[in-house]
Amino acid sequence: VPPGEDSKDVAAPHRQPLTSSERIDKQIRYILDGISALRKETCNKSNMCESSKEALAENNLNLPKMAEKDGCFQSGFNEETCLVKIITGLLEFEVYLEYLQNRFESSEEQARAVQMSTKVLIQFLQKKAKNLDAITTPDPTTNASLLTKLQAQNQWLQDMTTHLILRSFKEFLQSSLRALRQM
């Protein structure tokens, strides 16, 4: 059961219910576990994990990344700006997570779990955010054409894209977790 659902808390009546921050923290760690499981399948299936050609393909993908200006690093840390960046970044990752859905054979359910858990995480974070006006939602039409473009790539590029999405999403979540623990 994903940590976004309450069954574990119900099963342990003597335990203090998780705070909002603890639930977010737990949710991110759950998603990272899922990403790691998906990485195993991609690395076993192709040699992408050892590839040095990452940079070539990375130029064609506009994956969300933390930068100094986002206020998530300790130097220049800004809670509100950072929270907006985390939510915006996760919303931008959603189209890439959708792309991953038919990319796995034995880990199909895991890919779905990562996608659904990310949606839950976004909901948790939106409740925490005060300045929801600053959060820009990606344009559905743009996302649809991006998805079509990604799915039209040759096999090698699709494998590389899958690898890069998982690696970038992992690093984005790690940065987010570090920042959220400062809040």
Partner: antibody, heavy 127, light 111 residues
């Protein structure tokens, strides 16, 4: 008990590539959320972190060494390796391999705590 | 980018307490609880003493303790013993999956 052992040539010529391997026993490098690091120490000087390969096989390098450094792993042999290209006499050092990953390191990407170390191997760069 | 700043040497008498400082910036020591301390005896590999600022590694005596204030971390060794004479290094996570060490401090146990 986890044990690490560095191996490789003790003498490398300037401009060549230094290659070292760390063999891990007492635990699999593919298990759990540990990461595997390389650290070096020039004679009479302090420790310098060079880079790490994490549980997923992702690598991170010290920015000033990034262009010359490559870390890889072979899970079937339970080994991970370091390659440092275009070496100069300044790269002469004792090279250590170590395990990192205590606490929430994997989830946070913070591999600064290394709990098991190899004994180290001295590599001299000289013609 | 420079490493963390440690005093080159400290000394103390047996049974006394010494503290070694490790000064960094908001990009490393100041970020979260990401500080570790190592002891290196002559001719040996470093040994982890403290991680996450103040957690003792497995098998480490409670004479060793760690703390942090702002951008400076500290290692305190109480009940000083002759076998504590060694080099001590701090390390910290630095932005973007990078690790940085201090320059090292040599501890001399007097007498």
């Amino acid at each position: 008990e986890v044990q690490l052992q560095e191996s490789g040539p003790g003498l490398v010529k300037p401009s060549q590539t230094l290659s070292l391997t760390c063999t891990v026993s007492g635990g699999s490098i593919a298990t759990s959320y540990y990461a595997w690091s390389w650290i070096r120490q020039p004679p009479g000087k302090g420790l310098e972190w060079m880079g790490v390969i994490d549980y997923d096989g992702d690598t991170y390098y010290k920015p000033s060494l990034k262009s010359r450094t490559s870390i890889s792993r072979d899970t079937s042999k339970n080994q991970f390796s370091l390659q440092l290209s275009s070496v100069t006499p300044e790269d002469t050092a004792v090279y250590y391999c170590a395990r990192a990953g205590l606490g929430d390191s994997y989830y946070l990407g913070t591999y600064y705590a290394m709990d098991y170390w190899g004994k180290g191997t001295l590599v001299t760069v000289s013609s | 980018q420079a490493g963390l700043t440690q005093p080159p040497s400290v000394s103390g008498s047996p049974g006394k307490t010494v503290t070694i400082s490790c000064a960094g910036t908001t990009s490393d020591v100041g970020t979260g609880n990401f500080v570790s301390w190592y002891q290196q005896l002559p001719g040996m590999a470093p040994k982890l003493l403290i991680y996450d600022v103040n957690k003792r590694a497995s098998g480490i005596a409670d004479r060793f303790s760690g703390s942090k204030s702002g951008n400076t971390a500290s290692l305190t060794i109480s009940g000083l013993q002759s076998e504590d004479e060694a080099d001590y290094y701090c390390a910290s996570y630095r932005s973007l999956n990078n690790v940085v060490f201090g320059g090292g401090t040599h501890l001399t146990v007097l007498g």
